[in-house]
């Protein structure tokens, strides 16, 4: 997260570290007691590694009563999902137990109405990801306030020349931005989970470049018949 | 330094709804989450739940769930509680507080509710 | 939930005397990771708002005055006033933070 600050601990109780060997590699989101939703393109960085899910964290590397690591029963990517675009950029963590549930620990609603968030909407972006150009790493999780911009300013040849489906949404990323390291992360809005952060290796903190958000309402049907 | 104003008191029909508010200053409205406690007349104190004003979580203790509608505006740095379906038990004064770390370091004054046919 | 209890309910004390009251929670409130117990301390003068004592059972909340000391671990707690003052007459509460919110019932520190 770039220009954001640290979170308030544990406030964010449906915040997952997606790991590899134990390391952070992308955000996640708790949707459900067993399961995790992140991002498709994290899995391409995870090679062979053991894939984890760390649930009830606010600091990566410090001992908290609610942090735990689960192990991932299944992994699924959406279908349609590419290496060489950032489409369909959802992927489904199936953890090999249902999650202890607590205040630190709760999955998040998500939005099934597929209807845009208005633009200028104020939205929150939570992470473990780098918070400078050079790449420092956070310890604990930081977090910023995004405005959602329009898909017709996003699409101008300027920003994202066209690129931006009706299936994404963008953010303002003028300074304060999501960046590598908070893809799959959750955006947000009215208490409601309504996008995931895209991994694509885009420029962080330029206005010019938006923040692309995968919409969940897009993928309900999706979401829903991997859960089921 | 951090402030809390919480609105004034309510005199409510049992069955109707209230809703109070807290103003905080003094800090990132959006940075802490805003948690309500309850207390009744000469008893103890009971956390209701609450709401992180950034992205607008909200969590609950469950025996509250029903009774209560947590919301903020960000734009004003107002939280809000809503309870409805009043009855005498929800006679009570009502605070809202902010955590430090882990524990609640910064109350608001507190609104007084009171329910009476 | 973790179920706190404080004892005594009330308390009868005169002005200079050392006063101890109880807190007990339901199931241990001491992490082993970090050796810390998630519990706090709370005053609370008639009419007035909730003021924090003590956090992480023990350390004493800046401007707090040094005649009060919490002390205990796992699943039993002691607020300690050294010597009481006028000033001190009020409702304490517990409260842990390890799981979902809870607080004691209180101990009313009264005069004799």
């Known amino acids: 997260i770039l220009g954001g600050r640290e979170a308030e601990a544990h406030a964010r109780p449906y915040m997952a570290s997606v790991q590899v060997n134990g390391e952070h590699l992308c955000g996640g989101v708790l949707v459900a007691e067993q399961w995790v939703l992140s991002a498709a393109h994290c899995l391409e960085d995870a090679a062979d590694g053991k894939v984890q899910v760390l649930l009830g964290a606010h600091s990566l590397s410090q001992p908290e009563p609610s942090k735990r690591l689960y192990d991932v029963l299944r992994a699924v990517p959406h279908p349609d999902s590419r290496p060489d675009t950032i489409d369909h950029d959802l992927l489904l963590l199936q953890l090999s137990e249902k999650a202890t549930l607590g205040p630190a620990v709760r999955p998040l609603p998500w939005q099934r109405v597929d209807r845009d968030v208005e633009p200028g909407t104020l939205c929150d972006v939570a992470g473990w990801g780098i918070v400078s150009h050079a790449g420092r790493r956070p310890d604990r999780l930081q977090h910023v306030l995004l405005p959602v911009l329009d898909r017709a300013t996003c699409n101008r040849r300027t920003h994202h020349d066209g690129a931006i489906t009706q299936r994404m949404m963008c953010a303002e990323s003028n300074r304060r931005d999501s960046c590598k390291g908070d893809s799959g992360g959750p955006l947000v809005c009215g208490g409601v989970l309504e996008g995931v952060v895209t991994s694509g290796s885009r420029v962080c903190g330029n206005r010019k470049k938006p923040g692309i958000y995968t919409r969940v309402a897009s993928y309900a049907a999706w979401i829903d018949s991997v859960l089921a | 330094q951090v402030q809390l104003q919480q609105s004034a008191a309510e005199l409510a029909r049992p069955g109707a709804s209230v809703k109070m508010s807290c103003k905080a200053s003094?800090?990132?409205?959006?940075?802490?989450?805003m948690h309500w406690v309850k207390q009744r007349p000469g008893q103890g104190l009971e956390w209701i739940g609450y709401?992180?004003?950034?992205?607008?979580?909200?969590d609950y203790n469950q025996k509250f769930k029903d009774k209560t509608a947590l919301t903020a505006d960000k734009s004003s740095s107002t939280a809000y509680m809503q309870l409805s379906s009043l009855t005498s038990e929800d006679s009570a004064v009502y605070y809202c507080?902010?955590?430090?770390?882990?524990?609640?370091?910064?109350w608001g004054q507190g609104t007084l509710v009171t329910v009476s046919a | 939930d973790i179920v706190m209890s404080q004892s005594p309910s009330s308390l009868a004390v005169s002005v200079g005397e050392k006063v101890t009251m109880s807190c007990k929670s339901s199931?241990?409130?001491?992490?082993?990771?970090?050796?810390?117990?998630?519990l706090a301390w709370y005053q609370q003068k008639p009419g007035q708002s909730p003021k924090l004592l003590i956090y992480?059972?023990?350390t004493r909340e800046s401007g707090v005055p040094d005649r009060f000391t919490g002390s205990g671990s796992g699943t039993d707690f002691t607020l300690t006033i050294s010597s009481v003052k006028a000033e001190d007459l009020a409702v304490y509460y517990c409260?842990?933070?390890?799981?979902?919110?809870?607080f004691g019932a209180g101990t009313k520190l009264e005069l004799k």
């Open positions: 199931q241990s409130l001491l992490y082993s990771g970090n050796q810390k117990n998630y």
């Open positions: 409260h842990q933070y390890y799981s979902y919110l809870t």
């Open positions: 992480w059972a023990s």
């Open positions: 003094g800090y990132t409205f959006t940075d802490y989450t």
């Open positions: 709401i992180n004003p950034s992205g607008g979580y909200t």
């Open positions: 507080a902010r955590r430090r770390d882990y524990w609640f370091a910064y």
